[in-house]
């Protein structure tokens, strides 16, 4: 969590006095101390981790998490059933696929069990918090003497993802970047046969099915170039790895996708 210094000399304060053990438990410091912010990320719509910075508590505190979905059939308050820990202190909660409903408002509540009135509630749009797995099975083939095509797969509904391709040669100091829509392929029209190229790709759940800001991890890099002999079958025998985008994928111009698809459909 980032904090902002509100005054240049730190003079704005809340004094927390602890008197005797007979004092009520809602002493000033405990009841006014803000709870840490909860950050949730939905990993490939397979599971979701909601985490908080447990270290921001001035004493060891096993904060508890409850959640529900606002204005929906799933509005019953649920307790976290799978806590994540940092040094034996709760620092997160993992929710499984069946508990994730991307297109309903997710409400998450953090509470201090030592001081139940110390609680904080946040509302999150889960479709904006999806992080896909990194693209896999990067393959290259020649379209012509000087043109290369890069293909990859995602373990997800392909039409929900946009992609970023980076490539560079061993002579370059920085990457060249190219955005790619849901088609998950990229062509490089002019290739210098004397150079070695490196490609990598990452993906994002945007813009058709959500508006996520976070990219996946980068794929493993794939190389092509001068130290690869022309006889190397790697350049040519990759058709089995290439897949055309199905009509189903191309027809997904709507913002929403069905819960059933999200839970059961994986496109390889």
């Amino acid at each position: 969590l980032n904090t902002t210094i509100l005054t240049p000399n730190g003079n704005e304060d809340t004094t927390a006095d602890f008197f005797l053990t007979t004092m009520p438990t809602d002493s000033l410091s405990v009841s006014t101390l803000p709870l840490p912010e909860v950050q949730c990320f939905v990993f490939n719509v397979e599971y979701m981790n909601c985490t908080w910075n447990s270290s921001s508590e001035p004493q060891p505190t096993n904060l508890t998490l409850h959640y529900w979905y606002k204005n929906s059939d799933n509005d019953k308050v649920q307790k976290c059933s799978h806590y994540l820990f940092s040094e034996e202190i709760t620092s997160g909660c993992q929710l499984q696929k069946k508990e994730i409903h991307l297109y309903q408002t997710f409400v998450v509540q953090l509470q201090d069990p030592r001081e139940p009135r110390r609680q904080a509630t946040q509302m999150l749009k889960l479709q904006n918090l999806v992080i896909p797995w990194a693209p896999e099975n990067l393959t290259l083939h020649k379209l012509s003497e000087s043109q290369l095509e890069l293909n990859w797969n995602n373990r997800f509904l392909n039409h929900c993802l946009e992609h970023l391709v980076q490539y560079r040669t061993d002579w370059d100091h920085s990457w060249t970047e190219q955005s790619v829509d849901y088609r998950h392929k990229f062509s490089l029209p002019s290739v210098d046969g004397q150079k070695r190229y490196t490609f990598r790709v990452r993906s994002r759940f945007n813009p058709l099915c959500g508006s996520a800001q976070h990219w996946s991890e980068w794929s493993h890099p794939i190389h092509w170039g001068s130290n690869t002999s022309k006889e190397n079958p790697f350049l040519f025998a990759l058709e089995a790895e290439q897949k055309l985008i199905s009509e189903e994928d191309l027809g997904g111009e709507q913002k929403l996708i069905s819960e059933e698809d999200l839970h059961h459909h994986h496109h390889h």
Partner: antibody, heavy 122, light 108 residues
């Protein structure tokens, strides 16, 4: 590497105010996982925690009951330091004073100042 | 407040001895118990945190155990540099943070 450097007078007259400062390097007094503590040590009381300040979107202070009415701990973000003031001192306040940092999630004092012997005497 | 009681308050031992110091909390503190070593004129130095975890750079002859209310610090084979005062400290329920009264380890 975090370092805490203490400064302040070693001799204070009874009824006056004891003032010490702890300069922080290698961390920020506004860290949102640290608490900045004052501890003193005397033969009669052993190691005695006096209080702490910490920043969690605003400043908080906790004080020990034994000194609550006489103590003030203040952070200074512009100088990256925090200070201790003890009012109306008596000879019983004679001790070695330490500043120390505690952080979660392990909650121990890993970094200490070098200590300042403060003698209360006329 | 949670009171911390160390025993013994002082102890005489010889180089090579195995030494055990105990610390008892007035109520359960889970494993939030730390041990410090202090030499004259110096600030305390962290040895063991979370009851049994050895702080980086501390010799392996130091070990800690316990949970709840009863804890021990063990030095398996005393070295000349180990003669010092040892303190336990709880951070489970704060404020206040409380220390044991100390155990002074002297050369026999």
């Amino acid at each position: 590497q975090v370092q805490l450097q203490q400064s302040g007078p070693g001799l204070v007259k009874p009824s006056q105010t004891l003032s010490l400062t702890c300069d922080i390097s290698g961390d920020s007094v506004s860290s949102n996982i640290a608490t900045w503590n004052w501890i003193r040590q005397s033969p009669s009381r052993g190691l005695e925690w006096l209080g702490r300040t910490y920043y969690r979107s605003k400043w908080y202070k906790d004080y020990a009951v034994s000194v609550k009415s006489r103590i003030t701990i203040n952070p200074d973000t512009s100088k990256n330091q925090f200070s201790l003031q003890v009012n109306s001192v008596t000879p019983e306040d004679t001790a070695v004073y330490y500043c120390a940092r505690m952080t979660g999630p392990r909650y121990y004092f890993e970094y200490w100042g070098q200590g300042t012997l403060v003698t209360v005497s006329s | 407040d949670i009171q911390m009681t160390q025993s013994p308050s002082s102890l005489s031992a010889s180089v090579g001895d195995r030494v055990t110091i105990t610390c008892r909390a007035s109520q359960s503190i889970s494993s939030y118990l730390n041990w410090y070593q202090q030499k004259p004129g110096k600030a305390p130095k962290l040895l063991i945190y979370a009851a049994s975890s050895l702080q980086s750079g501390v010799p392996s002859r130091f070990s800690g155990s316990g949970s709840g209310t009863d804890f021990t610090l063990t030095i398996s084979s005393l070295q000349p540099e180990d003669f010092a005062t040892y303190y336990c400290q709880q951070s489970y329920s704060t404020p206040p943070i409380t220390f044991g009264q100390g155990t002074r380890l002297e050369i026999k």
